[in-house]
């Protein structure tokens, strides 16, 4: 009996036309939502004038439906048993699941000012930038609507910066009508233990953002894993959002709509400094902000963001070192709300429920030559927003799963 089930599972999890896996893989049957909480700065003047702690108040959730578009350019390669695809991006605002509208205003760090002052360190260029910042009436902080902050706005300061520069700024700009990839993943036809594992991303096996093993593209995209998942496994996956591969470890057994699943979580060790977790040495890319690689819980992804000083962390600086959150008031990290988990059905390896949580931060540094940054006495890793991307198998799909998969085994 068990052998027959194994054979059936192996057949059905292959990523090719006609299998259960393929149908759900091309276009997810799960509704996926991305909730945003924006960190509204309460004391912009005090920070700019006196280098005070930044007082933030989170506002949210503002919810978007995401991942509703089918994969594009799906191409099987029979020679190397892979399937390649693009994952199109799309976001639809869900007013009924949100605390306000996309027109709500927030006081946030001026993204362009922080980025330009970081990218251009030369003092004479900084004098020019200062002139343009003042001329455009820009400051260290700005008021922007949710729509502008997420999806893009024309920045008045950047509009004065001479060619060639993108004058549109947004944390997720450009998003709609773009696609992530090309991904090329193993379809599992020849070896089921490799199904969904990424072979190449954008035509390469490495990212070119990190040194050594940190640069590798490991595992799947976390939507599914090879079947027959064991609790002892370390599940590797790649996330283009954070420009790196990461891993999850087993935490607990969970019952999801009558389906037994394994809850895998991203452990604090994954965010540790190289002092505590030597494997992370290659995620430490500079010595000053990281205090000689002793800081932890923030990931400098500037190399992946055209030099813009973007730092990724867990929400509210969960699992981050005290020095990171010390200049920010109003944060309350807790594991339950702010960690990332994947609920995986172990027989098929399908992720039936997940919560992916991350925070986008921007580094801002003092600058002698830029008036609006002149009074700063320290570096700040400024939280801009955090997001919670969630998906849960629907009731109908869960019934089907119970009857066709778990029911048969039990």
């Amino acid at each position: 009996g068990d052998l027959l089930i194994q054979k059936t599972i192996k057949k059905q999890v292959v990523l090719e036309e006609g299998t259960i896996a393929f149908k759900n893989w091309v276009k997810t049957g799960t509704e996926v939502y991305r909730q945003f909480w924006i960190f509204d700065v309460q004391n912009p003047q005090e920070v700019m004038m006196n280098s005070s702690n930044i007082q933030v108040k989170q506002r949210g959730p503002y919810t978007y439906r995401v991942r509703f578009l089918a994969k594009e350019n799906v191409t099987q390669d029979a020679e190397d048993n892979t399937v390649s695809f693009l994952q199109p991006n799309g976001a639809i605002f869900e007013p009924s699941l949100s605390v306000g509208t996309e027109a709500d205003n927030f006081t946030v760090l001026n993204l362009a000012v922080a980025a330009a002052s970081h990218i251009y360190q030369n003092q004479f260029v900084q004098m020019i930038l200062n002139s343009l910042i003042n001329k455009s009436k820009s400051s260290m902080f700005q008021v922007r609507t949710l729509r502008e902050l997420l999806w893009g706005y024309r920045d008045p300061f950047l509009s004065l910066v001479p060619y060639p520069v993108t004058t549109t700024v947004g944390l997720f700009y450009p998003y709609n009508n773009t696609a992530d990839g090309v991904y090329k993943v193993f379809n599992g036809k020849d070896n089921i233990s490799k199904v969904a594992i990424i072979d190449t991303y954008k035509g390469k096996r490495n990212l070119s953002y990190w040194e050594s093993h940190c640069d590798m593209i490991n595992g799947t995209d976390a939507a599914s894993f090879p079947p027959f998942v064991e609790k002892s496994q370390v599940l590797q996956f790649f996330s283009s959002d954070i420009c790196r591969s990461i891993y999850a470890v087993f935490e607990s057994d969970v019952n999801l709509k009558g389906i037994p699943v394994y809850r895998f979580v991203l452990p604090s060790k994954a965010f540790a400094s190289p002092v505590e977790n030597p494997d992370n040495y290659c995620f430490c890319t500079e010595k000053i902000i990281s205090k000689n690689c002793t800081s932890y819980g923030v990931l400098d992804i500037s190399k992946c963001k055209e030099g813009r000083p973007v730092y990724i962390s867990l929400p509210h600086f969960l699992y981050a070192s005290p020095d990171v959150s010390e200049p920010i008031d109003g944060l309350n990290p807790n594991e339950e709300e702010h960690r990332t988990y994947l609920d995986i059905e172990p027989i098929t390896g399908f992720t039936l429920q997940f919560a992916k949580r991350l925070q986008v931060n921007l580094l801002v540094k003092p600058s002698e030559k830029i008036q609006v940054l002149k009074n700063l006495k320290r570096n700040y890793i400024v939280p801009i927003l955090w997001l919670n991307e969630t998906g849960t198998i629907g009731d109908e799909k869960a019934n089907m799963f119970r009857s066709q998969v778990t029911g048969k085994i039990n």
Epitope: N122, F124, L132, L160, V161, P162
Partner: nanobody
């Protein structure tokens, strides 16, 4: 090979005028912000005037506002600084500079001496 060549410096009495000119070659001139900096003996180099590329937005150091005027001629690849009501404290070496977002530091000219003295 990018070259910026300043001219028009000299000795002038307080209250007098001078027009500095900077001729550029080897660069797509119209895509650059052009600036004039100056450096007085024993002092830091400071930004005096700036003109952006498209639209030609201008900006000036507070100390020269209302007295100096920067202009550009993209066809001739020149940038000029008209200096009126000159004061002794305007005495310095004046440098022409070109910068755009692809550069981490500006291009510089050799400088031209301006002396305001009676």
């Amino acid at each position: 090979q990018v070259q910026l060549q300043e001219s028009g410096g000299g000795l002038v009495q307080p209250g007098g005028s001078l027009r500095l000119s900077c001729a550029a070659s080897g660069l797509a001139f119209s895509t650059y912000a052009m600036s004039w900096y100056r450096q007085a003996p024993g002092k830091e180099r400071e930004l005096v005037a700036l003109i952006t590329s498209a639209g030609g937005t201008t900006d000036y150091a507070d100390s020269v506002k209302g007295r100096f005027t920067i202009s550009r001629d993209d066809a001739e690849k020149t940038v000029s600084l008209q200096m009126n009501s000159l004061k002794p404290e305007d005495t310095a070496v004046y440098y022409c500079s070109a910068w755009r977002a692809t550069l981490f530091k500006p291009y510089w000219g050799q400088g031209t001496q301006v002396t305001v003295s009676s």
